[in-house]
């Protein structure tokens, strides 16, 4: 029967007792950089090159005994996971392997560094179809292995790592550091974060998504036929290398942003038990599970977006957090948190040409985050409008005003430490959604945008209890694009985007009391593209 | 059921082709190899090649690479063992049968074609 | 190559006595990796297709009479028909399928004696 991996990607309408999606990435090359490989495996022969490419340092230990199966075991098994014709994801798909970690799965920065320029060097030499690197590999963070994936992936190749099995803040790691790499973490058959030893899967911010990556069956370098289980970040990172291939097979055309917002968008939500990770983490660690997409064509007219959280500001008073969205991105949001709730408020403001999303600590507080709502979002024209505080009772307000432009979030900024929390929150007057409301002695920001088609609509969700969480989604057919909260509540720590739902979250009701200043309302921002969707039909 | 279904007997002379074939049927075709196994007269098995009918991908025993060829047509089920040019030492009784990377023996053979070569 | 060698080429046992036939690789068919043997038994009656009796040296293939067990690892095999019955009249072939080319023992013949 199907192995419960391939099962766990493939969505239901393509379930059988045998794992055979439309597609099998045949477009696409691959590119492994890992251990040496058995390429006369039955499982991989004929589909894996075996390049002449080899840096790797020498194995430790003077009583260390080269056993070729033993080398060739972790590569093997990847290359299988990938593009394997019985077990792998991407039956279909080409690899090339690049010997860059030796008998003991070890390797260095500068052995990867010159892989990775091999690869460059060979994409401009003979430029085929899309390509996928696959670095199942985890090293401490490098800012210059970093840039290095940096530069690969600007010039058109999409990278996907392990996140690393170190049960740990992934972004203390190299490649999965890295915001242009597709950092992917492992998952079990129960959804839940892989366990390995006292260890496991990396978490936080900087993965992007979660994998199969437990007792995963694939090609064992001891014999011909052999096959074995093997568990970790990069037999997860591998199954989302071989997703890639079929997606770009599908659709060539894909730009990483694009690909990444579909490995996403097209993820199963909210299946893991987030009590694994450490409590600090779970915010910040993506619940998603990555699958195939149900059809490989027709996802196009979607309005893509994902949520990116920034570095932790730190405590000191003046502290900021940025986060970025991709190149190919739009910010049509931004949001900011603080476990103490103490902050001062985020604003959208342009760096290099790009909006990025800056959250403010404030003076006894431990630390912001900023959270970005990034979008991909065609022929757009984004601008952020900013009101400066009222001062008067009815708060602060910024609309859009330029013709066609339509509002896709709200922040709010205040350079007082605590802003008069003892008034009412301001409702926003009926009939005018296309304004952002705030704190007399807060300046407002919103980010309003023109593009083809696109529609928007406010939604929200009030509580007059206090209580630690209130959220509000966005229904079939529309994405959010902005979440806040509105303003008058001194026990708000924050708000933030989970796939489709706008989350604001409180402090401990226990501390606040239960008091009329308890209200606590969230506001989700709704967009469609009427463009996309008929861009769509014509196509099919 | 699972089953594979050979073609008849063939009688042929030194120098001529023939292609014989094995339909499957009652599983998933793509997803198993098939392997050809040759008898000769009153001998062991010995076995001959495979192809994995998912991807055509085919795998060769050294002792009859470039003397037979075998292919497969998915869409039907099918696979086949074809020679070019045939000998009076090709006479033997052909087997096809099958195997799956988790079970990689031969579970479900054919019924056996007999070829006979002779002038 | 994996050299299979069988023994003995020929056997004759009375109805209802034990049979036992070995089989040596030229090489260990046992891999560490999933801790199996990569050894198959094949039954072949005159006039038909071999059949499977034994997988992996000692799991037997659904609807085989318990009467057949295999046992051995590494290169040294045996399968034994514990009594034997009329209809167990065959040639027995022993095969590894852990590397390419596949390879079988000579084979067994097995006569009622």
């Known amino acids: 029967s199907i192995p419960w991996n391939l099962e766990r990607i493939t969505p239901p309408r393509y379930r059988a007792d045998e794992y055979q999606p439309p597609d099998g990435g045949s477009l696409v090359e691959v590119y492994l950089l890992d251990t040496s490989i058995q390429s006369d495996h039955r499982e991989i022969e004929g589909r894996v090159m075996v390049t002449d490419f080899e840096n790797v340092p020498e194995e430790d230990g003077t009583r260390f005994h080269r056993q070729a199966s033993k080398c060739d075991s972790h590569g093997t098994h990847l290359a299988g996971v990938v593009s394997g014709r019985d077990a792998g994801v991407a039956k279909g798909a080409s690899m090339r392997s690049l010997r860059v970690l030796n008998c003991q799965g070890k390797g260095t920065v500068s052995g990867t560094l010159i892989g990775l320029e091999f690869i460059r060097k060979s994409q401009l030499v003979q430029p085929v179809g899309p390509l996928v690197v696959l670095l199942p590999l985890a090293g401490g963070y490098s800012r210059v292995l970093n840039a290095a994936c940096q530069r690969l992936a600007r010039a058109g190749v999409v990278l996907v790592t392990a996140a690393g099995n170190f049960r740990d803040d992934a972004c203390l790691y190299s490649p999965a550091s890295a915001p242009e790499v597709i950092t992917v973490g492992a998952t079990n058959a129960q959804d839940q974060p892989v366990t390995l030893g006292t260890l496991g899967t990396n978490f936080g911010r900087c993965v992007d998504l979660f994998a199969p990556g437990e007792d995963i069956i694939g090609a064992s370098s001891d014999c011909s036929t052999c096959f074995v289980s093997q568990s970790g970040t990069s037999q997860a990172a591998a199954h989302v290398a071989g997703i890639a291939a079929m997606m770009l097979s599908a659709e060539p055309e894909l730009t990483l942003a694009e690909l990444r917002q579909r490995l996403i968008h097209f993820s199963a939500k909210d299946v893991i038990n987030e009590a694994w990770f450490p409590e600090d983490q779970r915010v910040l660690t993506p619940n998603l599970v990555a699958a195939l997409p149900p059809s490989t064509h027709g996802a196009g007219w979607q309005l893509f977006c994902r949520t990116v959280w920034s570095a932790h500001s730190g405590p000191t008073r003046m502290a900021t957090a940025v986060a970025r969205c991709a190149p190919d991105e739009e910010l049509l949001s931004c949001s900011s948190f603080s476990r103490s709730g103490k902050r001062r408020g985020e604003r959208m403001e342009a760096q290099g040409g790009k909006l990025v999303c800056r959250a403010h600590n404030a003076f006894g507080g431990e630390g912001v985050y900023a959270i970005a709502r990034c979008c991909l979002l065609p022929q757009a024209n984004c601008s952020v409008h900013t009101a400066p505080p009222a001062e008067a009772s009815m708060g602060t307000r910024v609309h859009c005003h330029q013709q066609g432009h339509v509002l896709t979030g709200c922040s709010s900024h205040w350079e007082v430490e605590d802003l008069g929390t003892h008034k009412p929150p301001v409702l926003r007057p009926r009939g005018q959604p296309n304004q952002c409301v705030g704190h007399r002695e807060a300046s407002i920001h919103a980010s309003c945008c023109h593009a083809p088609g696109l529609e928007c609509k406010v939604k929200e969700h009030g509580i007059p209890a206090p209580q630690e969480q209130v959220t509000v989604a966005c229904e079939e057919g529309w994405t959010l694009t902005g979440c806040s909260a509105l303003p008058g509540t001194s026990h708000v720590l924050g708000a933030y985007a989970v796939d489709n739902t706008c989350v604001v979250r409180s402090r401990d009701v226990s501390t606040t009391g239960s008091t009329s200043e308890g209200a606590v309302t969230a506001v989700a921002i709704c967009c469609r593209s009427r463009h996309l969707a008929q861009a769509s039909q014509e196509l099919q | 059921q699972v089953q594979l279904v050979q073609s008849g007997a063939e009688v042929k002379k030194p120098g001529e082709s023939l292609k014989i074939s094995c339909k499957g049927s009652?599983?998933?075709?793509?997803?198993?190899?098939i392997s050809w196994v040759r008898q000769m007269p009153g001998k062991g098995l010995e076995w001959m090649g495979m192809?994995?009918?998912?991807?055509?991908?085919?795998s060769y025993n050294p002792n009859f690479q470039g003397q037979v060829t075998i292919s497969a047509d998915k869409s039907i089920s099918t696979a086949y063992l074809q020679w070019s040019s045939l000998k009076a030492s090709d006479t033997a009784m052909y087997y096809c049968?099958?195997?799956?990377?988790?079970?990689?023996?031969?579970?479900?053979w054919g019924q056996g074609t007999l070829v006979t070569v002779s002038s | 190559d994996i050299v299979m060698t069988q023994s003995p080429d020929s056997l004759a046992v009375s109805l209802g006595e034990r049979a036992t036939i070995n089989c040596r690789s030229s090489q260990s068919v046992l891999y560490s990796s999933n801790n199996k043997n990569y050894l198959a038994w094949y039954q072949q009656k005159p006039g038909q297709p071999p059949k499977l009796l034994i997988y992996w040296a000692s799991t037997r293939e659904s609807g085989v009479p318990d009467r057949f067990s295999g046992s051995g690892s590494g290169t040294d095999f045996t399968l034994t028909i514990s009594s034997l019955q009329a209809e167990d009249v065959a040639v027995y072939y022993c095969?590894?399928?852990?590397?390419?080319?596949?390879?079988f023992g000579q084979g067994t013949k097995v006569e009622i004696k």
């Open positions: 049968a099958r195997d799956h990377w988790s079970k990689p023996f031969f579970d479900i």
């Open positions: 192809i994995y009918p998912g991807d055509s991908y085919t």
């Open positions: 009652g599983y998933s075709f793509t997803n198993y190899y």
């Open positions: 095969q590894q399928y852990s590397s390419f080319p596949i390879t």
